[in-house]
Interface confidence: low
């Protein structure tokens, strides 16, 4: 279920899957929520530790049992991912942090009159992930009112420093507040060029697009269908970026599909989950559990309820069925995507709905009935 | 290092310069200080030069041009080349150097932590390669220690880029698809370090690559985690304590 409590002065020991710098525990929790394997996190505020390298450290953790031993650490904050928390799942983070400089690649500097204007500039720049603003009282006069737009390889700051009269924050693109707008078109038989930032396996271009939307550095993508000529590249979803923010070239290519991240859409973003079930498809991955259930929908529900489950395959092979129930294989991988996608199998596959924000399992929302 | 920038004092305090003094003296390879008396480097640095008395190891330095005849250096007590390394292949490109005298640690000269044995689960997102090597394919040794931030590439992706070589599980690759940033000649033996949980770890030893910083040709590094048993075995001192830095 959904666990929202935070543990003050506690640090989870072990289980690290990733680490990064974040300005506070809430942002760390959000990164944990969207990380494919993170179940728990621990955050070290600047006040909690003398080691400059570990200040603002956000440690994402996984555990086979869903829990880890807590050790006392003054000032540390720990908690759970919000993967099963329905309406609380959002990549939107509006906070502005005073007295903090979030470091990254500074790719644009301009003079603005307020931190809000700086955040708006970041939100309206295709490559900007976060920003820092030197206020009117910054100690070096030439830097005052400077708005620095930034990005980094992982989408989070490469370092965070305590610095007076500097204010920092994140792009509000995940809040659907970008003025850029987005391309909803999907381009059949077209491959985009430029830099690959990641490669995952997906069953279709729509899942590929959703993964691109929530990947910090993906601006557009190319998907190679299951009939692509090179067998090893079938179902490959290439997440891409470029200096300009758009593909520098595109090549007509049979059995490829390309499109853009929807992060810059106004008003609404796609849900960070994939609800479609794919008949005749087997998703390969690390086996989490195998259970007998009645029907593919129940298999998907079982996967959704088991927090570590990322995707599943429901087998209809006679040897995998007992009366009305068949084997439901609950699976996971390092990146949350299948490690292999096979076609022509007797069964169906799909994804956990743990990141769908329409769930009714939030402890912080009141469910209202429709009239 | 291609596409890199100047490092600053004490930024990479484990980086050492392996130099050969024959008729003239020149920098040949990098290396990483892993203990008071131990340096980890690439085996191929000793191809043709296995004589320990010709080598000079400079630690705690930033600028090679600052080296004079009075600059202190370490000498080699023992070169331990991995038993399975072959000159004709790229595999097991790892060597340990035991120094004649232990080094004191300072802000500018201290060891890098080693990864856990067989570390395959850690996802490293902040990795850097450093060295005084060429800044372009047909370049020359650089005076100031260079650094460059390079993402790790999966072995599967790396194998695709090097279809005529075997990329083994004991190698790790790093590079940008578009090229432009990479290690190069003279960086061999030096460190590929990644920051994880606020701690720098030695993930790779600069080994080889198709040219330098070419598109779709990542750099190939010896994966240190795969050689932890070997490192521990070789660095065990007589009192049974490992003379190197390993994360708690």
């Amino acid at each position: 279920g959904c666990l929202t409590q935070l543990y003050e002065n506690a640090f989870f020991r072990g289980g690290d899957v990733a680490s990064m710098y974040t300005p506070n525990a809430q942002y760390c929790q959000m990164r944990c929520t969207f990380h494919p394997r993170c179940l728990l996190f621990s955050f070290l505020p600047a006040s909690s530790i003398n080691d400059m390298e570990k200040r603002f450290g956000c440690f994402l953790k996984d555990s086979v049992t869903g829990t880890l031993p807590k050790v006392h650490r003054t000032g540390a904050v720990s908690g759970h991912s919000l993967k099963q928390c329905g309406h609380q799942i959002s990549a939107c983070h509006r906070d502005i942090y005073k007295g903090v400089d979030m470091r990254g690649v500074n790719f644009n500097v301009s003079k603005v009159s307020s931190v809000e204007e700086c955040q708006k500039r970041c939100t309206s720049n295709i490559r900007c992930q976060f920003f820092s603003y030197a206020t009117q009282t910054f100690h070096k006069a030439e830097y005052r009112n400077n708005c620095l737009l930034k990005y980094s390889p992982g989408g989070t700051p490469t370092a965070i420093k305590v610095l007076s009269n500097v204010e920092s924050g994140f792009s509000l693109k995940p809040c659907a507040l970008s003025e850029i707008g987005c391309h909803m078109n999907i381009f059949q038989h077209l491959a985009f060029s430029d830099v690959d930032v990641a490669r995952v396996l997906t069953p279709d271009a729509f899942v590929c697009r959703t993964i691109c939307t929530y990947h910090p550095n993906c601006l557009f993508f190319t998907f190679y269908t299951n009939v692509w000529k090179i067998e090893s590249q079938r179902n490959v979803c290439l997440l891409k970026t470029s200096e300009s923010g758009t593909p520098s070239s595109s090549t007509p290519q049979e059995n490829t599909i390309s499109g853009y991240s929807l992060l810059t859409c106004k008003r609404t973003l796609p849900e960070p989950c994939h609800s479609k079930i794919y008949p005749g498809v087997d998703f390969g991955g690390e086996e989490l559990n195998v259970t007998f259930v009645k029907g593919v929908n129940v298999c998907q529900e079982t996967c959704t309820k088991m927090i570590r489950c990322q995707f599943f395959t429901y087998s209809l092979l006679p040897e995998d069925c007992k009366e009305e129930k068949c084997k439901c294989f609950l699976r996971l991988s390092m990146d949350g995507s299948p490690t292999r996608i096979a076609y022509g199998t007797q069964g169906s596959s799909g994804y956990s709905l743990r990141l769908c924000n329409t769930g009714d399992n939030s402890v912080c929302t009141t469910k209202t009935s429709t009239r | 290092i291609v596409g890199g920038t100047n490092s600053s004092w004490g930024e990479w305090p484990w980086q050492v310069s392996l130099q050969v003094k024959l008729t003239a003296q020149r920098h040949l390879c990098g290396g990483s200080l892993i203990g008071h008396q131990w340096v980890l480097t690439a085996a191929h640095c000793f191809d043709g030069l296995p004589l320990q008395d010709v080598w000079r190891i400079y630690s705690g330095i930033l600028n090679l041009s600052d080296i004079t005849k009075d600059t202190p250096f370490s000498q080699i007590k023992e070169i331990i080349i991995h038993q399975n390394y072959k000159v004709s292949e790229g595999n097991h490109d790892i060597a340990l150097i035991k120094l004649q005298a232990p080094l004191n640690y300072t802000e500018f000269q201290k060891p890098i932590c080693l990864p856990s044995k067989g570390d395959t689960s850690t996802i490293y997102t902040n990795c850097w390669v450093t060295g005084w090597g060429f800044s372009k394919e047909k370049g020359e040794i650089q005076n100031i220690l260079q650094k460059v931030n390079i993402p790790l590439v999966t072995n599967e992706e790396c194998q695709k880029r090097y279809q005529d070589y075997k990329i083994t599980q004991r190698m790790v690759c790093a590079g940008y698809k578009e090229g432009g940033k990479d290690a190069c000649k003279g960086d061999s033996g030096g460190p590929l370090v990644c920051k994880h949980n606020g701690m720098w770890r030695l993930v790779g030893i600069t080994s080889w690559g198709e040219g330098c910083a070419r598109r779709e040709q990542p750099g190939v590094y010896t994966k240190v985690a795969e050689y932890m048993d070997w490192i521990l075995e070789k660095t065990q001192s007589s009192d049974g304590k490992a003379q190197m830095q390993s994360p708690a």
Epitope: - | V20, L28, G90, K138, D164, G186, G211
Partner: antibody, heavy 122, light 106 residues
Framework: EVQLLESGGGLVQPGGSLRLSCAAS????????MMWVRQAPGKGLEWVSG????????VYADSVKGRFTISRDNSKNTLYLQMNSLRAEDTAVYYC???????????????WGQGTMVTVSS | DIQMTQSPSTLSASVGDRVTITCRAS??????LAWYQQKPGKAPNLLIY???TLESGVPSRFSGSGSGTEFTLTISSLQPDDFATYYC????????FGQGTKVEIK
């Protein structure tokens, strides 16, 4: 500047011996595979022999196997070709060469010396 | 041993012509093929390696293609400086050169 300078060529009688040298400068000689390539007058290029960076591995074309020996002295930055039992068909310009970049131990040659002429005649 | 066969052995062409030289390997060499240009009395000069990668400093009118056993060197618009002998070389297993193609003025 990178340079390869061959020497030791000359006129020799069939059955005789000759030792060619190639002095290298401007690069880290000990890092590279070195090669000898020859070209008979008016003919094409023929690879003769190669030596890996440490000197521990040597390879030869079938036409010279057992007669020629390649060696190197990394401390002197010098490559050698000891040619014994010379025949008329060994008459050629002999070039030393190496490839200065690329994957270790496997590449084309892009740095050549200017060559030294060996004439085998009675 | 891998044999390399070049064709034609001589090629007569004029300035501005598009020139194509082919090279065939006796067995697959993947992309491990280089092309050299040689002028009389001079050492060869590397133009292309790995079948299609242009060596730095070589004019873009030179291009290479092919893999496996069939390879091609193309000069898109022949210049006066391009009249020379061209060699292919495999480096998949040791090193073998083709017999050369002389490009002469028509």
């Amino acid at each position: 500047e990178v340079q390869l300078l061959e020497s030791g060529g000359g006129l020799v009688q069939p059955g005789g011996s000759l030792r060619l040298s190639c002095a290298a400068s401007g690069f880290t000689f000990s890092h590279y595979i070195m090669m000898w390539v020859r070209q008979a007058p008016g003919k094409g290029l023929e690879w003769v022999s190669g030596i890996y960076s440490s000197g521990g591995i040597t390879v030869y074309a079938d036409s010279v196997k057992g007669r020629f020996t390649i060696s190197r002295d990394n401390s002197k930055n010098t490559l050698y070709l000891q040619m014994n039992s010379l025949r008329a068909e060994d008459t050629a310009v002999y070039y030393c060469a190496y490839r200065r970049t690329g994957v270790p131990r496997r590449d084309a040659f892009d740095i050549w010396g200017q060559g030294t002429m060996v004439t085998v005649s009675s | 041993d891998i044999q390399m066969t070049q064709s034609p052995s001589t090629l007569s062409a004029s300035v501005g012509d598009r020139v194509t030289i082919t090279c065939r390997a006796s067995q697959s060499i993947s992309s491990w093929l280089a092309w050299y240009q040689q002028k009389p009395g001079k050492a060869p000069n590397l133009l292309i390696y790995k079948a299609s990668t242009l060596e730095s400093g070589v004019p873009s009118r030179f291009s290479g293609s092919g893999s496996g056993t069939e390879f091609t060197l193309t000069i898109s618009s022949l210049q006066p400086d391009d009249f020379a002998t061209y060699y292919c070389q495999q480096y998949n297993t040791y090193w073998t050169f083709g017999q050369g193609t002389k490009v002469e003025i028509k």
